[in-house]
Interface confidence: low
């Protein structure tokens, strides 16, 4: 024993009480209450386990310690005293940690970070999800390709991120009533055509299409060089009345002031209606044709280059008018006969009949159309009786097969041929010039002259003319020639029959028609030997 | 095409505040967010911040926030970034960039750039 | 804030050469990494995006590897217009971070 009369073999954790005993320190406990024996230990009290003598409070955790213990706050809560441990429930100020607030990017990005009690979660925002790698990372939802298909088919669905929209596509606007973005939109096409939303040249039209416009030509005008047709940007200049003047190196009165008058027509034509101008083109070629004035004294390939030019160019404006004109059937017959018939419509492929007096086609209305021109498709005839004095003296081009032919029918050469037009002149156009070679060849009927008229003075009326010996009835068609001026030729046409004062041809490609009654000037073999 | 046009330089004087922009085309303005990124020879490329056009909502880049403001006018399909207190530190090329999204995530179409000289 | 450190600022190469471009990330960013290419007086253009995709336009002598921490891009046969200074760029976690760049120069 010590000096205090204290036992020195006290265990661990313990002091002593006399000379004899020892009692555990406080938080620790042994066998018995006082210890007499150096073989007792004095063992660790922990107040933590249950039952607990030890209330810490809400949010908080009992941790043992060596003949002690602590209470301390729960992960996720702070003591607002700010010390951190405290021994029963009455010290107990654990609160909440806002871990949002601590570390805003606990939830990383397009993630919204939700404190709770002790803990935060993660929420990615509307229209995210969390990749698969991280929980904490969202990632935008592309709701537009994710087979939720969450737009109406009238819209396009424009993925954004964290959202989408459903907008309307291009050229289309939300129906009455309808928002444009939400997925609730529902759309429809504009008509920016109607609406004034185009910008559309004024030299143009303006076409509406679905989700779009286009831009075309004006009737009678044409795009400007290097400019496509039907687009948003076209640019079109006039083109109505560009090329009438004289062939080069004609020198003729009557002619030029014919031109000049056209021309001033052509100046006429902006302020009056197609049907006016068509009326007054077919007026001036007819004086022409009554009063040839100096012409009649050109010679003869001259007269017939001035035809030749003459039909082309009533051909293109023919065309280009027709274009201004209302769908449906035109005819015009001026006092001299001459006629035009016009068929304008929608393309399509059914067989179209059209024509009159003079002359009458049958064709596949898509040979009509083309493929250039989207528009109504045009169809014409335009027959000139009076062309004597123009087409006088004209020739005709017999190909080497057609020459062969008549050779072997004749059994001898072909010297020359005595030509007598039975019809009028008959040009055929349609809404486009690629007519060298149809795609179906077409039907026509041409009406012979009541007294015809043979190119080289009157004849007696021909009405059912049949041919004699060494005649034949022809479908022959001015063709351009640099040495001639012109001439007739009937390549790709042919004659079905002939009946009731006309005549049927099948031909495969376009011209000026008329029907000819040829004479063949046959070499006679008995007479060559007699005058050898 | 789609394009961010932006102005090519500003000088401004040290202390004062510049305000730039970046104006969108060929696409629907409200549909992307737009994204500020500086880039000077010394720090390379930073981010600012980013603006959702739609709802004017931003996010920013803590060493720019108090010095760079994100706002957007969707009249004029404009974004703008207006830095403020300019010192010879702020020097640099502000590009404007829209923010793709969706499974790509990057800047697909990028302005030109505003080059910014801080100088008296 | 994650660190994006392209350790070499220049990279001396010839036109065939194969060249490849580390980056390497301050801690995890998965495989959010775009690499950009920016030639001078222009404005960056994406090369790669998710380290490896390629984005449809860029030559497939263009290539990204890496997740992580680890990021290559490799350009295959350099040819003359590949010069220029190449960025990588997290977009992980805010603030998107990018690279100092490695200018990719001729011998």
């Known amino acids: 024993q010590d000096s205090r009369g204290c036992a020195r073999w006290c265990p661990q954790n313990s002091s002593c009480v006399n000379a004899t005993a020892c009692r555990c320190n406080p938080g620790f406990s042994s066998f018995s209450e006082i210890i007499t024996t150096p073989t007792e230990t004095c063992d660790d009290i922990n107040e933590c386990a249950t039952p607990s003598k030890v209330s810490c409070g809400k949010f908080s955790d009992c941790w043992n310690t060596e003949g002690s213990y602590d209470c301390v706050c729960s992960p996720g809560y702070e003591p607002v005293s700010g010390a951190k441990t405290f021994k029963n429930e009455s010290e107990n100020t654990c609160q909440d940690v806002d871990e949002c607030q601590q570390n805003p990017r606990l939830c990383k990005s397009y993630g919204t970070c939700v404190n709770t009690l002790g803990s935060y979660t993660c929420q990615c925002l509307p229209g995210f999800k969390f990749i698969p790698e991280d929980p904490k990372v969202c990632t935008d939802v592309n709701e537009c390709t994710s087979g939720q298909n969450p737009c109406h088919s009238s819209t396009h669905c424009l993925n954004n991120v964290g959202s989408y929209q459903c907008r309307c596509r291009p050229g289309w606007q939300p129906i009455p009533g309808s928002p444009n973005g939400p997925n609730n939109t529902v759309c429809e096409d504009v008509d920016e055509c109607s609406s004034g939303q185009h910008q559309c040249d004024s030299s143009t039209v303006c076409f509406n299409t679905v989700g779009s416009y286009s831009c075309r030509c004006r009737p009678g005008w044409k795009p400007r060089h290097g400019i496509p047709n039907n687009q948003k940007d076209t640019v079109c200049e006039d083109m109505t009345f560009s090329t009438w003047t004289p062939p080069p190196g004609v020198h003729s009165q009557t002619l030029s002031r014919f031109f000049d008058k056209v021309q001033d027509l052509g100046r006429d034509s902006k302020t009056s209606s197609a049907e006016v101008t068509i009326q007054n083109v077919i007026k001036l070629v007819d004086e022409l044709m009554e009063a040839p004035g100096d012409v009649e004294a050109l010679a003869p390939p001259v007269r017939h280059l001035i035809a030749t030019q003459l039909l082309s160019n009533l051909e293109d404006i023919m065309r280009i008018l027709a274009k201004s004109l209302p769908k449906g059937p035109f005819t015009y017959i001026s006092p001299s006969n001459t006629e035009l018939t016009l068929m304008i419509q929608e393309r399509g492929d059914k067989n179209v009949t059209m024509g009159q007096s003079s002359a009458r086609m049958k064709l596949n209305w898509a040979v009509a159309a083309g493929a250039e021109d989207p528009g109504p498709a045009v169809a014409g005839i335009l027959s000139i009786q009076n062309m004597t004095t123009l087409l006088a003296n004209a020739s005709l081009n017999l190909h080497s097969k057609k020459q062969a032919e008549l050779e072997e029918i004749y059994e001898s050469s072909i010297r020359g041929v005595q030509l007598r037009r039975l019809s009028a002149v008959n040009s055929i156009f349609l809404s486009h010039n690629n007519t060298k070679e149809l795609n179906s060849p077409i039907l026509f009927a041409f009406s012979h002259l009541e007294s015809s008229d043979g190119e080289a003075g009157r004849d007696p009326p021909a009405k059912d003319v049949m041919p004699g010996p060494r005649q034949e009835l022809l479908c022959a068609f001015w063709k351009s020639d640099s040495d001639r001026g012109g001439h007739w030729a009937t390549e790709g046409c042919q004659v079905l029959g002939s009946k009731n004062g006309s005549t049927t041809c099948q031909c495969s490609h376009l011209s000026s028609f008329a029907i000819l009654m040829a004479h063949y000037d046959v070499e006679d073999w008995k007479l060559t030997l007699i005058t050898r | 095409q789609v394009q961010l046009q932006q102005p090519g330089a500003e000088l401004v004087k040290p202390g004062a505040s510049v305000k730039m922009s970046c104006k969108a085309s060929?696409?629907?303005?409200?549909?992307?967010?737009i994204h500020w990124v500086k880039q000077t020879p010394g720090q390379g490329l930073e981010w600012i911040g980013a603006?959702?056009?739609?709802?004017?909502?931003?996010s920013y880049n803590r060493k720019f926030k108090g010095k760079a403001t994100l706002t957007a006018d969707i009249s004029s399909s404009t974004a703008y970034l207006q830095l403020s207190s300019l010192t010879s530190e702020d020097s640099a090329v502000y590009f404007c960039a829209r923010f793709y999204g969706g499974s790509y995530w990057y800047f697909d179409v990028w302005g030109a750039g505003t080059t910014v000289t801080v100088s008296s | 804030d994650i660190v994006m450190t392209q350790s070499q600022k220049f990279m001396s190469t010839s036109v065939g050469d194969r060249v490849s471009v580390t980056c390497k990330a301050s801690q995890n960013v998965g495989i959010n990494v775009v690499w950009y290419q920016q030639k001078p007086g222009q404005s960056p253009k994406a090369l790669i995006y998710s380290a490896s995709y390629r984005f449809s336009g860029v030559p497939d002598r263009f290539t990204g590897s890496g997740s992580g921490t680890d990021f290559t891009l490799t350009i295959s046969n350099v040819q003359s217009e590949d010069l220029a200074e190449f960025f990588c760029?997290?977009?992980?976690?805010?603030?998107?971070?990018f690279g100092a760049g490695t200018k990719l120069e001729l011998k």
């Open positions: 603006i959702s056009p739609g709802n004017g909502d931003t």
């Open positions: 060929g696409y629907t303005f409200t549909s992307y967010n």
């Open positions: 760029q997290q977009y992980n976690s805010s603030p998107l971070t």
